[in-house]
């Protein structure tokens, strides 16, 4: 069976939107009006992995682009990147672990924990116009809480 996917946008708990920053990076900034069209639309695929009531494994692709968020070690540090894939083979139900995030719902907010690096989360900073990254703390000054807005396909 084909993998189930939905289209969505994400905003952090400060209401910053996510946009492309160069070819292989996302950044977070406040958008309004027509600028909202800049925000990236994700194709969130529900993939194989450890699942519970509030924890669902997903892959985050960029809609109509063969790019997926992935988590890899760079200079011995877990790092978030946009990785190019062969569109003929993705998305798939059994995604490689670097592409998998545990979508965790807490109090109507979402966290995205790396399956490859437990306790590392998709993060934004308080500052405007700075990259989205993989952070190793929750509840500190880095932002790990997001809301999801559904986009019709």
């Amino acid at each position: 069976a084909p993998v189930r996917s939905l289209n969505c946008t994400l905003r952090d708990s400060q209401q910053k939107s996510l946009v492309m920053s160069g070819p292989y990076e996302l950044k977070a900034l406040h958008l309004q009006g027509q600028d909202m069209e800049q925000q990236v639309v994700f194709s969130m695929s529900f993939v194989q992995g450890e699942e519970s009531n509030d924890k669902i494994p997903v892959a985050l692709g960029l809609k109509e682009k063969n790019l997926y968020l992935s988590c890899v070690l760079k200079d011995d540090k877990p790092t978030l990147q946009l990785e190019s894939v062969d569109p003929k083979n993705y998305p798939k139900k059994k995604m490689e672990k670097r592409f998998v995030f545990n979508k965790i719902e807490i109090n109507n907010k979402l966290e995205f924990e790396s399956a490859q690096f437990p306790n590392w989360y998709i993060s934004t900073s308080q500052a405007e116009n700075m990259p989205v990254f993989l952070g190793g703390t929750k509840g500190g000054q880095d932002i790990t809480d997001f809301t999801m807005q559904f986009v019709s396909s």
Epitope: S125, A127, N129, F133, G135, Q141, D142
Partner: antibody, heavy 118, light 107 residues
Framework: EVQLLESGGGLVQPGGSLRLSCAAS????????MFWVRQAPGKGLEWVSV????????RYADSVKGRFTISRDNSKNTLYLQMNSLRAEDTAVYYC???????????WGQGTLVTVSS | DIQMTQSPSSVSASVGDRLTIICRAS??????LAWYQQTPGNAPKLLIH???SLQSGVPSRFSGSGSGTDFTLTINSLQPEDFATYYC?????????FGGGTKVEIK
Amino acid sequence: EVQLLESGGGLVQPGGSLRLSCAASGFTFSKYFMFWVRQAPGKGLEWVSVISPSGFMTRYADSVKGRFTISRDNSKNTLYLQMNSLRAEDTAVYYCARVGYGGNSDYWGQGTLVTVSS
Amino acid sequence: DIQMTQSPSSVSASVGDRLTIICRASQDINRWLAWYQQTPGNAPKLLIHSATSLQSGVPSRFSGSGSGTDFTLTINSLQPEDFATYYCQQADSFPLTFGGGTKVEIK
């Protein structure tokens, strides 16, 4: 008053290492992104590296990637740049700068000179 | 990487002149552009951020305009302390990049 004071520059042979420090005062260091920017003698400005307040997000210019490492100690209000495998073309005044709104450098240190020569 | 091209690379002007410096980005950077002033032996000083916003404490004779790929820094009525080198810098994406500089000399 915001102050940034770089130290650690000097003369080093090609292939050698150096660690620059930047002592910050007059603002809440732990809340700000920080940059290193360099300027070769008689040349323009070149961005080198950035680090987020928590230290989890770092980025580097291609010219220093794999050789330089940016870090910070928020308890000491200090920014660092570890420079390995130094080359003649790394000779420059190195400035640390506080990152302002959207990615500009709103305060700069006075700079420290790094000379790579045999 | 985004290339930033400044023109002119140098210019001679007199006190009281109105001066315009141009900065072009190799791709759209929205309004994520800053301008700096640097005098010999000193660190750069931020003049303008977000293309048009005057940094606190900077005289109002300095102004910035533009968005997308084309930006200008204008100095109305040059003062003796304005003879310096000016740099633009894009903050749209990493790696951040600077223009090559514009040296403003006394005619």
